[in-house]
């Protein structure tokens, strides 16, 4: 079935009993209106198994499937199911056809933005093309981060977009670093935000037919210095078979630049602890957070000697944090046996007396063990 100016199955009459599968080819930018059952008894529309909401750019409403302007992501399988009985009333596959413009590209809806479009479309007030990208209304971000607000829209004629801050026209001239406006993304970007950037940001999208607006709230969080935060439960106790590969994961969150070490607890002269009560450790890996894979410790072809306790240690200019896990290595001939890894229960102070190479951060620091 090849669609022309508008895809419609009208009127909304009861469907025939034998609903065969249909394929509809829809041009990008084209409105779609498909009916299923009588209006008051219309079925529910589903796309790829998810029921369509009664509002939005793509909606299922009173037995009607409506797409304001067909986009590439709208392609797919649509089902209309009878209310209550879940009988399939319509089984449609919408396929992306050529754009309604001169472009032969099948990816993006260029008709929204082509003011020289020679096709005589009905005028259309602006509407949001990607409302799912606008769901996050409140942006609370740390100072220094980049912030982006987007209001992707379309209409005919092509709408313009302008931005307001706290109700006033906003061009960023008083902002250190200025702002970046990407009209093709319908976006406002501010790099390295500061507390004075807090406020309400409004995108105003308008054309000759109408206008729409949307408010974003920006809160800039002043950085509170703290030692690194390690995600709970990582690294995790792990059981492996001799000869296998093991990955231990440690997720580190830190405002200040963190440095990470992976340590293995070792035995010296038959003891795990020195005379001072601190454990002996061997540094396996050291790097800063921007280094590749620093948060993962890879152990290749493990042997029985690799069994033991491993610690992820993260430090910044404020302090240190660390968490540990046990690796249990099973013999190859008995892979089904599993042993509970011993719980790490230390109340001692832990001191790493190894040269850490971490810009003196770790030097002589005593830190509480925490899990």
């Amino acid at each position: 079935l090849e669609a022309s100016e508008e895809v419609e199955l009208e009127p909304c009459l009861a469907p025939s009993l034998e609903q065969q599968e249909q394929e509809l080819t829809v041009a990008l930018g084209q409105p779609v209106r498909l009916c299923c059952g009588r209006a008051e008894r219309g079925g529910h529309w589903y796309k790829e198994g998810s029921r369509l909401a009664p509002a939005g750019r793509v909606r299922g409403w009173r037995g009607r499937l409506e797409i304001a302007s067909f986009l590439p992501e709208d392609a797919g399988r649509y089902l209309c199911l009878a209310r209550g009985s879940m009988i399939v009333l319509q089984n449609l596959t919408l396929i992306t056809g050529d754009s309604l413009t001169s472009s032969n590209d099948d990816e993006d809806p260029k008709s929204h933005r082509d003011p020289s479009n020679r096709h005589s479309y009905p005028q259309q007030a602006p509407y949001w093309t990607h409302p799912q990208r606008m769901e996050k209304k409140l942006h609370a971000v740390p100072a220094g981060n980049t912030v982006k607000f987007r209001c992707p829209a379309a209409g005919n004629p092509t709408p313009t977009i302008r931005w307001l801050k706290d109700g006033q026209a906003f061009h960023g001239e008083n902002r250190i670093g200025g702002i970046r406006l990407r009209h093709q993304h319908w976006s406002l970007v501010m790099e390295s935000v500061v507390p004075s950037d807090r406020g309400t940001y409004t995108c105003l999208v308008e054309n000759a037919v109408g206008s729409i607006r949307y408010n974003y709230l920006l809160d800039v969080l002043e950085r509170s210095p703290h030692r690194p935060i390690l995600q709970a439960g990582l690294p995790a106790n792990t059981t492996a078979v001799v000869g296998s590969d093991v990955e231990l994961l440690c997720k580190v969150y830190s405002d200040a630049q963190p440095h990470i070490q992976w340590l293995k607890h070792i035995v010296i002269n038959g003891s795990s602890f020195g005379a001072d009560g601190f454990p002996y450790v061997q540094v396996l890996k050291t790097a800063d957070i921007n280094s590749s894979e620093v948060e993962v410790l890879y152990l290749r072809n493990v042997s029985a000697e690799d069994a033991g306790e491993y610690t992820c240690l993260a430090g910044n200019s404020i302090g240190l944090s660390y968490q540990s896990a046990w690796l249990t290595v099973l013999p190859e001939e008995d892979p089904t046996w599993t042993a509970a890894a011993p719980e790490a229960r230390y109340t001692d102070k832990l001191e790493f007396r190894h040269d850490s190479g971490l810009n003196d951060i770790f030097e002589a620091q005593k830190i509480e063990w925490h899990e």
Epitope: D108, K110, H130, Q184
Partner: antibody, heavy 119, light 107 residues
């Protein structure tokens, strides 16, 4: 079908200049933002510069700002990169790439042109 | 600039394996992340855009997930033609950045 063809690469001495071109076909060129992305030998990808369809938006990576200039001629369906004050670290394969509308995914790439900066 | 950290930097896998590559951003980038595949001597190829959308013509064994700072590219069943280098790319900032790449090699 969409095609992007770069040209203009070659060997140049440090401090020298080169102008790369990217001829586009198979789509409405003026509707799309275009970018240059480079890749030093044996290294990863590095974004260089972007220009929107109407040339009203231009952005550069810090590493090339003030030395490289991106431009386009929509009547000729061509993207350009003027590279001045070239350095050894600019040695790379330079790709031109098209951005999807509403997003900055590079959905089509040229085959690349090699720029070698060496004395 | 927003830093993108990929892990692992390389991995060995066999045909049929499930492969997962992760990418972490130094700050929240919403879902403004793409994944590319590159083979030696060739231009990169777009696989996934906006974190989870499969590019037209890309096999369905490729999938992407994540939002905010942590993202994943998954190949559900590795095929011989999938041995390549994979890059993530953020476009939340106007100064785009790529991850350093993950090379997927034959075991």
């Amino acid at each position: 079908q969409v095609q992007l063809l770069e040209s203009g690469g070659g060997l140049v001495q440090p401090g020298g200049s080169l102008r790369l071109s990217c001829a586009a076909s198979g789509f409405t060129f003026s509707d799309y933002a275009m970018s240059w992305v480079r890749q030093a030998p044996g290294k990863g990808l590095e974004w260089v510069s972007t220009i929107e369809g109407d040339s009203n938006y231009i952005e550069y990576a810090d590493s090339v700002k003030g030395r490289f200039t991106i431009s386009r001629d929509n009547s000729k369906n061509t993207l350009y990169l003027q590279m001045n004050s070239l350095r050894a670290e600019d040695t790379a394969v330079y790709y031109c790439a098209r951005e999807r509308t509403y997003s900055s995914a590079f959905d089509y790439w040229g085959q690349g042109t090699l720029v070698t900066v060496s004395s | 600039d927003i830093q993108m950290t990929q892990s692992p930097s390389s991995l060995s896998a066999s045909v049929g394996d499930r492969v997962t590559i992760t990418c972490r951003a130094s700050q929240d980038i919403s879902s403004d992340l793409n994944w590319y595949q590159q083979k030696p001597g060739k231009a990169p190829k777009l696989l996934i855009y906006d974190a989870s959308n499969l590019q037209s013509g890309v096999p369905s064994r490729f999938s992407g997930s994540g939002s905010g700072t942590d993202f994943t590219l998954t190949i559900s069943s590795l095929q011989p033609e999938d041995f390549a280098t994979y890059y993530c790319h953020q476009w939340y900032s106007t100064l785009y950045t790529f991850g350093q790449g993950t090379k997927v090699e034959i075991k």
